[in-house]
Amino acid sequence: KLTIESTPFNVAEGKEVLLLVHNLPQHLFGYSWYKGERVDGNRQIIGYVIGTQQATPGPAYSGREIIYPNASLLIQNIIQNDTGFYTLHVIKSDLVNEEATGQFRVYPELPKPSISSNNSKPVEDKDAVAFTCEPETQDATYLWWVNNQSLPVSPRLQLSNGNRTLTLFNVTRNDSASYKCETQNPVSARRSDSVILNVLYGPDTPTISPSDTYYRPGANLSLSCYAASNPPAQYSWLINGTFQQSTQELFIPNITVNNSGSYTCHANNSVTGCNRTTVKTIIVTELSPVVAKPQIKASKTTVTGDKDSVNLTCSTNDTGISIRWFFKNQSLPSSERMKLSQGNITLSINPVKREDAGTYWCEVFNPISKNQSDPIMLNVNYNALPQENLINVDEQLYFQGGSGLNDIFEAQKIEWHEARAHHHHHH
């Protein structure tokens, strides 16, 4: 069967298309090409008589068509009006006619798009921004890219106008990014240059660093203030409510106790019209800047579990200090058997249990300094084990705690022979 194939089917304006003929019959008298889906003399492009090799242009001939030896038709310099159907009419030597129709579509070669914006300096949480991809092109698909990624899903992002317009509602600083639009049709794809969205925001609540509150007389006080802001914030300092200077850093050398007070950093963004403040209390004190290392004294370091008690004392010569105790990196007291007394100087454990064995240390501190003791090791022994906690597994003696079978219990100085003899006596 006679058929027509368009190569390509989607043709760019200015390019060319070949209407390729398949299964052309043998013994032809001639053939004609027509614009449209039927044979119409008013729409004949060209006719060809094989015997004379004579071609005759018709009313629809544009000067851009060429007939190939196999009756295929090449159309050059394609224009939008060329879109549509083409019919080949074949006249065989026996004067029997045959027809076939093919078609192609014409699309413009897309220009490089550009992005227009209705707001070049939107303010965070206040403004919306609408980007529009220019120009408007028929039969084009519009796509958007943010930092070269496809659009994220967000209730604040809305596509409209056939995806040609991208609107960002209540912009945030996180919307500050590179935006591109892309136009596509079946014959081309073009991407715009980047448009950088510059969202104005802030200032956020300022932070004052360093975080120290306590200073010694004679030290230098150097404070720095920072607040996230676009454009960058302008800073000013107040001490006890009195304006000092308009800088980001505040420096006071050789401070005295008179420099104690409230230090306020004021951050202002003149473009957003917003300002924020943070207040920091500075205390200049004669308190010892270096707390001496305390020492622990123990009433005993090896005790018998469930029987003995122990007192640990944290010794220090410093005044105006506080004391806290630690056991295995945990703050104490951690059970009802532990008591602190004499302003936390003494830690009493009564009675001592097996789980109390381990490392203890104390820490002494004042508002501007701290120090900790060397650790002390408390050993907990058991001279005998209650019968109900001993079980025999493969002639090995084990200690069974409340939570099941433990590893071989190797507490120091247990009289194993005595315990084992006792165990065998009852079995």
Partner: nanobody, 119 residues
């Protein structure tokens, strides 16, 4: 008056190369709707449009039988088209005609140049 003059044919061994030239006059090969091409005729075979080019746009087409072996090109300053033929085979033996279509590829032909591929 349109004239096409071919040259460059000859005898070549299989696997060899030849370059055919087609000097055109009476029209400008760089005009936007102008095509130029090479048609070959061999005894007992149908004539075949082996390669064609639009010199203004650089569009080229090749017959499946020569794809990857033949290259068509033009030099618009000389108003001349070329056919570079590599890896020649015995079945490439034919008379090669330079052709310029007005309506069809039969409209204007040169006198032809003979290519013989034989060992």
């Amino acid at each position: 008056e349109v004239q096409l003059v071919e040259s460059g044919g000859g005898l070549v061994q299989p696997g060899g190369s030849l370059r055919l030239s087609c000097a055109a006059s009476g029209f400008n090969i760089k005009d936007s709707s102008t095509y130029i091409g090479w048609v070959r005729r061999a005894p007992g075979k149908e004539e075949e449009l082996v390669a064609s080019i639009s010199c203004s746009r650089g569009n080229t087409r090749y017959a499946d039988s020569v794809k990857g072996r033949f290259t068509i090109s033009c030099d618009t300053s000389k108003n001349t088209a070329y056919l570079q033929m590599n890896s020649l085979r015995a079945e490439d033996t034919a008379v090669y005609y330079c052709a310029h279509p007005r309506y069809t590829w039969y409209d204007y032909w040169g006198q032809g140049t003979t290519v013989t591929v034989s060992s």
